[in-house]
Interface confidence: medium
C-alpha cells in the first residue's frame, strides 16, 4: 500500500509515545555530542510535524521522505561545525548521500564518562517529577553511547527502567532495591548493544547473505519444528528489520519488527510451540519475548542428513541449480539437529560442505568424492569443543579476574600495537565468557561461549577499524566473519613487535586509586599489566604473576597507610625498579 505521507504512516502505526522515543534515539545516535535539551526540542518538533501530517496528509512537506525530513532537521543544528567538524559537510550533500554521510560519522567510541547514578532520593525525585523527561534522558544517554543500539529494544529497556523506578521509589530502602536491579539491566543493555553491533557489522561488512545465513542457523536451532519455508520467511523479514535499524531508519525498523511479531504470533502453529505466552503481551514485550524465547523440542522423526546431502545421486544437480537454496536447506537441517553447536560452527560446516561440493561436482565421480563429507566435519567440531573445555578449566582455576589477566597477556602478545584501553576493554569482556558460559551444562557451553566471543571480537574489530594499527587484526577481522574467532585463537606472539620505550609516568599511581570501585581498580591494574607487556613482551607468565602479585601488595599496603599519597610516591618507584629488574 502506498502512503501519501511516510511520516504520517509511521506516526499512525507506532503511536505518539513510541514515535517520539524513536526520533529521540535516532537524533541521539547521529549527533552524539549534542546536549539532551537540544535533542528533546528536535524530537518534539518532528513529532508535532508528524502529528499534523497524520491529520492532513497533503500538508506542506508531508510527502517528503523520512531521510529528507530528518536530515533537514539535523542540518538546522547551529553548533554542527563546532561540535562535529567535517560532519557538517554532510549537509552539503543530497539524499541518499547525506544520510550515508551521517552514518559514516557515527562514533563507536565517543569517550563519554561511564554513567554514574546520583543518590537514589534525587533519582526518585526526578522520576516522580517528570517521568517522560526522565525516561527520555535514559534513551538519550544510552543511544549517544551506543550509536547502533537496536532502537525498538531500547524502548523496551526504557520501559523496564521505568518499572524498576516505579517499584523501588516506593520501597523503604530505595538504594537496596535500585542497586541490583539497575545493575542487572545495565548488563543486559551492554550485551544487547554488542549483539546488535555484531549484526550491523555482519550486514555492512559481509552483506545480506552472511546475515541471512547466521539467522537461518540461529532460528533453525530455536524453531526445529518449523519447516524451511517458514524459517526463510522469518529470516527475510528479520533481515529487513535489522538492515533498517543499522541504516538509521528506526521508524521503519520498529514498525516492521512489530509486523514480524504479529506474523509469528498468527502463525505460531507452524513455527514453535513455545510462542504462546509471548503472543499475549503488548508489542514491545511481545517482540522482546519472541527474540529471547526458549528452544522448541526437536521433532522425533528426523531422517538422516546423509540421505539428502550425501547418498542422493542428485546432490550435484540440486547444488548447481540453486546453490543458495540448497546450502540454506543444508544449514537448516544441520542446525535444527544440533542445538548444542555455536552458530559460527554451523556456518563453518556449511562452508566446508559448499567447498566440498564445489570441488567434487567438477570431478568424474562426484558421489565417491563427497561420500565422506560429513566425517570430515569432525576436526571443525573438535576445535571449539576443546577450546571451550581448556578455557573453562582455566577460568575455574583462576576466577574471573585471573582469567581476564590471562587473556590480557594472550591478546597483548598477539597484537601489542592495539591501544591499551582497547586491549583492556576487550580482554575484560572476553573474560566474562567464563562467568557467563562455563557454569552451563555441557550441551549449552559451546553455543554460549563461541557466539559470545564472536560478539566481543566484533567490538575489537570495530574499534580497530577506527584506528588500524595491526595488520594481523585487520586480516582476522575482514577475511571471514565465521572464522574470526579461530583466526584470533590461532594468532601466535607477534615477533615483529618492537618493545615500547619505558615511561615512568605510565607506572605512577596516586591515592585516588584507593577510593575507586573494585572494577575500576582492576582496570587500573590491568592497564599496568598491558603496559608492562608492551615494554617487556618476552616476559614469562611466571614473571608476570610475580610482578602483578607485588603490585597488588603495593596497592593494598599504600591504601592502608596513614599517608597514602606519600606511600605511593615513595614505594611506587621502588616497585617499578624491582619489576624492571625481575623482567630482564
Amino acid at each position: 500500500e502506498a502512503y501519501k505521507s511516510e511520516i504520517a504512516h509511521r506516526y499512525n502505526d507506532l503511536g505518539e509515545e513510541h514515535f517520539r522515543g524513536l526520533v529521540l534515539v535516532a537524533f541521539s545516535q547521529y549527533l552524539q555530542q549534542c546536549p539532551f535539551e537540544d535533542h528533546v526540542k528536535l524530537a518534539k518538533e518532528v513529532t508535532e510535524f508528524a502529528k499534523a501530517c497524520a491529520a492532513e496528509e497533503s500538508g506542506a512537506n508531508c510527502d517528503k521522505s523520512l531521510h529528507t525530513l530528518f536530515g533537514d532537521k539535523l542540518c538546522t543544528v547551529a553548533s554542527l561545525r563546532d561540535k562535529y567538524g567535517d560532519m557538517a559537510d554532510c549537509c552539503e550533500k543530497q539524499e541518499p548521500d547525506r544520510n550515508e554521510c551521517f552514518l559514516a560519522h557515527k562514533d563507536d567510541n565517543p569517550g563519554f564518562p561511564p554513567l554514574v547514578a546520583p543518590e537514589p532520593d534525587a533519582l526518585c525525585a526526578a522520576f516522580q517529577d517528570n517521568e517522560q523527561l526522565f525516561l527520555g534522558k535514559y534513551l538519550y544517554e544510552i543511544a549517544r553511547r551506543h550509536p547502533y543500539f537496536y532502537a525498538p529494544e531500547l524502548l523496551y529497556y526504557a520501559q523496564q527502567y521505568k518499572g524498576v523506578f516505579a517499584e523501588c521509589c516506593q520501597a523503604a530502602d530505595k538504594a537496596a532495591c535500585l542497586g541490583p536491579k539497575i545493575e542487572a539491566l545495565r548488563e543486559k543493555v551492554l550485551l544487547s548493544s554488542a549483539k546488535e553491533r555484531f549484526k550491523c557489522a555482519s550486514l555492512q561488512k559481509f552483506g545480506d547473505r552472511a546475515f541471512k545465513a547466521w539467522s537461518v542457523a540461529r532460528l533453525s536451532q530455536r524453531f526445529p519444528k518449523a519447516d524451511f519455508a517458514e524459517i526463510s520467511k522469518v529470516v527475510t523479514d528479520l533481515t529487513k528489520v535489522h538492515k533498517e535499524c543499522c541504516h538509521g531508519d528506526l521508524l521503519e525498523c520498529a514498525d516492521d519488527r512489530a509486523d514480524l511479531a504479529k506474523y509469528m504470533c498468527e502463525n505460531q502453529d507452524s513455527i514453535s510451540t513455545k510462542l504462546k505466552e509471548c503472543c499475549d503481551k503488548p508489542v514491545l514485550e511481545k517482540s522482546q519475548c519472541l527474540a529471547e524465547v526458549e528452544r522448541d523440542e526437536l521433532p522425533g522423526d528426523l531422517p538422516s542428513l546423509a540421505a539428502d546431502f550425501v547418498e542422493d545421486k542428485e546432490v550435484c544437480k540440486n547444488y548447481q541449480e540453486a546453490k543458495d537454496v540448497f546450502l540454506g536447506t543444508f544449514l537448516y537441517e544441520y542446525a535444527r539437529r544440533h542445538p548444542e553447536y555455536s552458530v559460527s560452527l554451523l556456518l563453518r560446516l556449511a562452508k566446508e560442505y559448499e567447498a566440498t561440493l564445489e570441488k567434487c561436482c567438477a570431478t568424474d565421480d562426484p558421489p565417491t568424492c563427497y561420500a565422506k563429507v560429513l566425517d570430515e566435519f569432525k576436526p571443525l567440531v573438535d576445535e571449539p569443543q576443546n577450546l571451550v573445555k581448556t578455557n573453562c578449566e582455566l577460568f575455574e582455576k583462576l576466577g574471573e579476574y585471573g582469567f581476564q589477566n590471562a587473556l590480557l597477556v594472550r591478546y597483548t602478545k598477539k597484537a601489542p600495537q592495539v591501544s591499551t584501553p582497547t586491549l583492556v576493554e576487550v580482554s575484560r569482556k572476553l573474560g566474562k565468557v567464563g562467568t557467563k558460559c562455563c557454569k552451563k551444562p555441557e550441551s549449552e557451553r559451546m553455543s554460549c561461549a563461541e557466539d559470545f566471543l564472536s560478539v566481543v571480537l566484533n567490538r575489537l574489530c570495530v574499534l580497530h577499524e577506527k584506528t588500524p594499527v595491526s595488520e594481523r587484526v585487520t586480516k582476522c577481522c575482514s577475511e571471514s566473519l565465521v572464522n574470526r574467532r579461530p583466526c584470533f585463537s590461532g594468532l601466535e606472539v607477534d615477533e615483529t613487535y618492537v618493545p615500547k620505550e619505558f615511561n615512568a609516568e605510565t607506572f605512577t599511581f596516586h591515592a585516588d586509586l584507593c577510593t575507586l570501585p573494585e572494577a575500576e581498580k582492576q582496570v587500573k591494574k590491568q592497564t599496568a599489566l598491558v603496559e608492562l607487556l608492551k615494554h617487556k613482551p618476552k616476559a614469562t607468565d611466571e614473571q608476570l604473576k610475580t610482578v602483578m602479585g607485588d603490585f597488588g601488595a603495593f596497592v593494598e599496603k599504600c591504601c592502608a597507610a596513614e599517608n597514602k599519597e606519600g606511600c605511593f610516591s615513595e614505594e611506587g618507584p621502588k616497585l617499578v625498579a624491582a619489576a624492571q629488574a625481575a623482567l630482564v
Epitope: 518449523a226 519447516d227 540421505a307 539428502d308 541449480e321 540453486a322 537454496v325
Partner: nanobody
C-alpha cells in the same frame, strides 16, 4: 500438516495420454518438494517424477524421461503429471507425496515423504 488429493486416473489405450492432478491443502505447494510415485500390483512404490519447492528443478525416472512432464500451478495449489505415449508397463496406482521443509530436494526414496494422497489408478490397455 499437508493434505493431498489425486485425480485424473482412468483407462487409456497404449500411446494415449492422461493428465493427473494432485490438489494440496494446509501448505503452499510451491514451498514443498513434491513428487509422483507409482505402485504396480505386488511391487514397491517407485519414483516417477519430482519438482523442488521454491525453485522449479524437475527430476524424472529414466523410464519416463521425454514422455512425462511434471508441473505445478501455484495459484491453484495443484501439482500435475502430464503423461504421453503411455505404455502397458505404466499401469499402476499413482500417488503424490510431499516433503515440507525440504523445499529444494526431491528424493527418489519414498520413505522420506511424510505426506501422501490416497492414489489414483492408471490402466494402460488395449
Amino acid at each position: 500438516e499437508v493434505q493431498l488429493l489425486e485425480s485424473g486416473g482412468g483407462l487409456v489405450q497404449p500411446g494415449g495420454s492422461l493428465r493427473l492432478s494432485c490438489a494440496a491443502s494446509g501448505r503452499y505447494i510451491d514451498e514443498t518438494a513434491v513428487a509422483w510415485f507409482r505402485q504396480a500390483p505386488g511391487k514397491g512404490r517407485e519414483f516417477v517424477a519430482g519438482i523442488g519447492g521454491g525453485v522449479d528443478i524437475t527430476y524424472y525416472a529414466d523410464s519416463v524421461k521425454g514422455r512425462f512432464t511434471i508441473s505445478r500451478d501455484n495459484s491453484k495449489n495443484t501439482l500435475y503429471l502430464q503423461m504421453n505415449s503411455l505404455r502397458p508397463e505404466d499401469t499402476a496406482v499413482y500417488y503424490c507425496g510431499a516433503r515440507p521443509g525440504r523445499p529444494l530436494i526431491t528424493s527418489k526414496v519414498a520413505d522420506l515423504y511424510p505426506y501422501w494422497g490416497q492414489g489414483t489408478l492408471v490402466t494402460v490397455s488395449s
